[in-house]
């Protein structure tokens, strides 16, 4: 990944972190009626060798990790990304001010892994 | 963000990069008979606002990008990860020195996206 952290910040292993998102903070309060926000969560952390079972790593991620160890300046570590996502239902105003109930897919992180 | 960039440079968007992996370099030449290596590829690049259609972003990634803009020190950008992976067939020796032909899933990156 293109992100660089200070050497003093030791990153923990890839995992799910809790994150509540307020639609008001996003400036969406005028068109989203409900909910007021939701537990979106996010993934963060290191995908370092060895990738254990908790990291839900793909075969490619395992290979990439080994190549990164051999060639760290050119091949990055795999990144920590969602492996399971859930939908949420949102009540909102459409462009014609109709009230719509819609299910939005892939909104909530349920699990993370190395990819 | 904790990243250091040259302000004059544009960040490169999340995309697939070519990578050939040699099984000899991985030290696997004694048990993998064929192929000698394969085009594994990898994903790298920025998942920055706005996430365009090429970035195959999930709804969660779009929300996370907006939250990152509001709170960059605590919520990272989404990461650039494989969205499509292919299998490869490998001819190898098992623990009993039998020759096995096996299809290994999720070995080759075909496409990348922001997750």
């Amino acid at each position: 990944s293109a992100s660089d952290y200070n050497s003093s910040e030791l990153k923990t292993a890839c995992r799910k972190h809790e994150l509540y998102v307020s639609f008001q903070d996003l400036g969406w309060q005028d068109w989203i009626i409900a909910p007021k926000g939701y537990a979106a969560n996010y993934c963060d952390g290191e995908c370092s060798f060895p990738l254990n079972a908790h990291m839900n790593a793909t075969n490619h991620a395992i290979v990439q990790t080994l190549v990164h160890l051999m060639n760290p300046e050119y091949v990055p570590k795999p990144c920590c990304a969602p492996t399971k996502l859930n939908a949420i239902s949102v009540l909102y105003f459409d462009d014609n001010s109709n009230v719509i109930l819609k299910k939005y897919r892939n909104m909530v992180v349920r699990a993370c892994g190395c990819h | 963000s904790a990243s250091d960039y040259n302000s004059s440079e544009l960040k490169t968007a999340c995309r697939k990069h070519e990578l050939y992996v040699s099984f000899q370099d991985l030290g696997w030449q004694d048990w993998i008979i064929a192929p000698k290596g394969y085009a594994a590829n990898y994903c790298d690049g920025e998942c920055s606002f706005p996430l365009n259609a090429h970035m195959n972003a999930t709804n969660h990634a779009i929300v996370q990008t907006l939250v990152h803009l509001m709170n960059p020190e605590y919520v990272p950008k989404p990461c650039c990860a494989p969205t499509k992976l292919n299998a490869i067939s490998v001819l190898y020796f098992d623990d009993n020195s039998n020759v096995i032909l096996k299809k290994y899933r999720n070995m080759v990156v075909r496409a990348c996206g922001c997750h």
């Epitope: 293109a2 910040e9 060798f49 | 790298d44």
Partner: antibody
Framework: QVQLVESGGGLVKPGGSLRLSCAAS????????VHWVRQAPGKGLEWVGR??????????MYAAPVKGRFTISRDDSKNTLYLQMNSLKTEDTAVYYC????????????WGQGTLVTVSS | QSVLTQPPSVSGAPGQRVTISCTGS?????????VHWYQQLPGTAPKLLIY???ERPSGVPDRFSGSKSGTSASLAITGLQAEDEADYYC???????????FGGGTKLTVL
């Protein structure tokens, strides 16, 4: 043949600034990750920092002693690497080398001859 | 103090074999990262001697060999020659941030 030539070293007072350059030739500069490494008189090698390629968003990273004071940049059109050094301290006195990273195992396969930076009042 | 630990000096007579150790930790060599070795002759820039633990760039004699085990690596020089007198450095990466780390250097004296 592959060549890296540093320039811009010299005598500077504590708190001063200096910009080092590293001119590359004999290879496709834009395809390589490049680093700065320094060596204080009579001491060992100390990593300063690096800059990645365009494909990795020219990401930079720095060693703790120089972070926030030094900035690495590159101009691929000029095949040149730069090290901008600000708020210099006496302990920054060293020979500064630029080094190219080979692309299969990430070793520093080519080094410049070095340029001496002396920080003294 | 360097992240990787090397003996400050080693010596040997011409024709002998010497080894230089490089001890790291679980966050660098022990994390699986490659180890490289550099030779620095007096008054010159360092030169890549061994890369990826045990591979030699073209032009490096096969008298030089490298190995790695656990959190340590070593450089072996057989058939010692007067021109081998130099400083030798090991180098790897720190796993948490992919920062480059060097050993403190070892001065080889050919007696």
């Amino acid at each position: 043949q592959v060549q890296l030539v540093e320039s811009g070293g010299g005598l500077v007072k504590p708190g001063g600034s200096l910009r080092l350059s590293c001119a590359a030739s004999g290879f496709t500069f834009s395809s390589y990750v490049v680093h700065w490494v320094r060596q204080a008189p009579g001491k060992g090698l100390e990593w300063v920092g690096r800059i990645k390629r365009e494909s990795s968003s020219y990401t930079t990273m720095y060693a703790a002693p120089v972070k926030g004071r030094f900035t690495i940049s590159r101009d691929d059109s000029k095949n040149t690497l730069y090290l901008q050094m600000n708020s210099l301290k006496t302990e920054d006195t060293a020979v500064y080398y630029c080094a190219r990273v080979e692309r299969s195992k990430s070793g520093f396969d080519n080094w410049g001859q070095g340029t001496l930076v002396t920080v003294s009042s | 103090q360097s992240v990787l630990t090397q003996p400050p000096s080693v010596s040997g007579a011409p024709g002998q074999r010497v080894t230089i150790s490089c001890t790291g930790s679980s966050s660098n060599i022990g994390a699986g990262y490659s180890v490289h070795w550099y030779q620095q002759l007096p008054g010159t820039a360092p030169k890549l001697l061994i890369y990826g633990q045990s591979e030699r760039p073209s032009g490096v004699p096969d008298r030089f060999s490298g190995s790695k085990s656990g959190t340590s690596a070593s450089l072996a020089i057989t058939g010692l020659q007067a021109e081998d007198e130099a400083d030798y450095y090991c180098q790897s990466w720190d796993s948490s941030q992919t920062l480059v780390v060097f050993g403190g250097g070892t001065k080889l004296t050919v007696l």
